[in-house]
């Protein structure tokens, strides 16, 4: 599960482990569960009291190249009458994911793992009220 | 794989797509150093669709710890602080990529894995099915 830092001695690995040069790791980017589909409730982004839109970010030097980001549509939340209630706040919910970055240095290519913060959707919260003395 | 623009001066033999297996530097770059200041640790309590967080551990996965959300109620919290069952709390789920040790227990050989995590909850209007 855990990745040792560069330049440190590695655990005496089982014979079945592939040989890997120091300071790097072998990564198979054929994704396990590639065809798994999200079974989220239908169009919750539109039915939510804190609705959001999706935009697709594209980066050809990233794997996967497509990352979907959500943006809250409103500052406030949608009330029962379908109107925006600014006494409540729509706020983004975020989650970290890993991507592989491809870097070109001259004609040579290297690969780097990267943590990317993805906005997944929005939720409606009661605001924090700061009382000024 | 995905197509990569390449330096026109480089040999043509270079593959334009991501290869199936790559050697990756062990140091992970963090794109999130300037974390969004709106990212708050108390949304789970202040939301009208509050959730609890559960610590999911998997020794063969990187990251080894992922926090998962579970909605506290079927309904949503109204202005009076009561659960309103005319609305529904639903999980916001996201597919994320993690690393899975492959073969198992190997210290520096991994495969990408797509997993589904519940990140938080949101309050939605229910879908009403009218029976004829």
């Amino acid at each position: 599960r855990k990745i040792p830092k560069v330049g440190h001695t590695f655990f005496q690995k089982p014979e079945s482990c592939p040989p890997v040069p120091g300071g790097s790791m072998k990564l198979d980017i054929g994704i396990i569960n590639e065809n798994q589909r999200v079974s989220m409730s239908r169009n919750i982004e539109s039915r939510s009291t804190s609705p959001w839109n999706y935009t697709v970010t594209w980066d050809p030097n990233r794997y996967p190249s497509e990352v979907v980001q959500a943006q809250c549509r409103n500052l406030g939340c949608i009330n029962a009458q379908g109107k925006e209630d600014i006494s409540m706040n729509s706020v983004p919910i975020q989650q970290e994911t890993l991507v592989v970055r491809r870097k070109h240095q001259g004609c040579s290519v290297s690969f780097q793992l990267e943590k990317v913060l993805v906005t997944v959707g929005c939720t409606c919260v009661t605001p924090v009220i700061h009382h000024v003395q | 794989g995905i197509t990569i623009p390449r330096n026109p001066g480089c040999p043509n033999s270079e593959d334009k797509n991501f290869p199936r297996t790559v050697m990756v530097n062990l140091n992970i770059h963090n794109r999130n150093t300037n974390t969004n200041p709106k990212r708050s640790s108390d949304y789970y309590n202040r939301s009208t669709s509050p959730w609890n967080l559960h610590r999911n551990e998997d020794p063969e996965r990187y990251p080894s710890v992922i926090w998962e959300a579970k909605c506290r109620h079927l309904g949503c919290i109204n202005a009076d602080g009561n659960v309103d069952y005319h609305m529904n709390s639903v999980p916001i789920q996201q597919e994320i990529l993690v690393l899975r040790r492959e073969p198992p227990h190997c210290p520096n050989s991994f495969r990408l894995e797509k997993i589904l995590v519940s990140v938080g909850c949101t309050c939605v209007t229910p879908i009403v099915h009218h029976v004829a």
């Epitope: 599960r1 | 640790s41 710890v65």
Partner: antibody, heavy 119, light 107 residues
Framework: EVQLVQSGAEVKKPGASVKVSCKAS????????FHWVRQAPGQGLEWMGV????????AYNQNFRDRVTITADKSTSTAYMELSSLRSEDTAVYYC????????????WGQGTLVTVSS | DIQMTQSPSSLSASVGDRVTITCKAS??????VGWFQQKPGKSPKLLIY???NRYTGVPSRFSGSGSGTDFTFTISSLQPEDFATYFC?????????FGQGTKLEIK
Amino acid sequence: EVQLVQSGAEVKKPGASVKVSCKASGYTFTDYEFHWVRQAPGQGLEWMGVIHPGNGGTAYNQNFRDRVTITADKSTSTAYMELSSLRSEDTAVYYCARFLTYEGYFDYWGQGTLVTVSS
Amino acid sequence: DIQMTQSPSSLSASVGDRVTITCKASQSVSIDVGWFQQKPGKSPKLLIYHASNRYTGVPSRFSGSGSGTDFTFTISSLQPEDFATYFCQQDYSSPYTFGQGTKLEIK
């Protein structure tokens, strides 16, 4: 430089509560978990629980579940551990420790806070 | 809970000696074991993580090995500053548990 600075020693009566703080500096507070571990005099270390300041999630050792509460204040980059219904066997040094959730190990520890429970 | 049984509980040695401490887990913990040094009145200091990886700045005389249930920590040539208590810890699954410690004293 990463630092975890804990609050000072406390003397408490049985049945009382104690709240120990751990102030972090030198890194982004919300990026890593905070764990609390205690060490009774002459004894080994005992894990009490964890908080992730980034999302507010907590998990506790069942042995302490009903008595311990771990919180975090992002505005001051401080984690807290409150232990209630104190008894004499809770006399111990209490440590906070930073845990790297990706890599999966404790790298930095606070200097410890001695809590003495005595009537 | 996973038990970590550490031995010996105390050990007398001289400067220059090679010292070995063992830790046995009650069930497999893969390579998810760390070794810490603690001096009186001080907090634990990480020496080894993931069974065999030296933490940043830790001298090369400290090493660790093992996987599954059996783990070993070695100081190849004791220095005066190494006299302290050492303990192992598993972070394979919570509740995370620790060995009882080995007190290393000057002979």
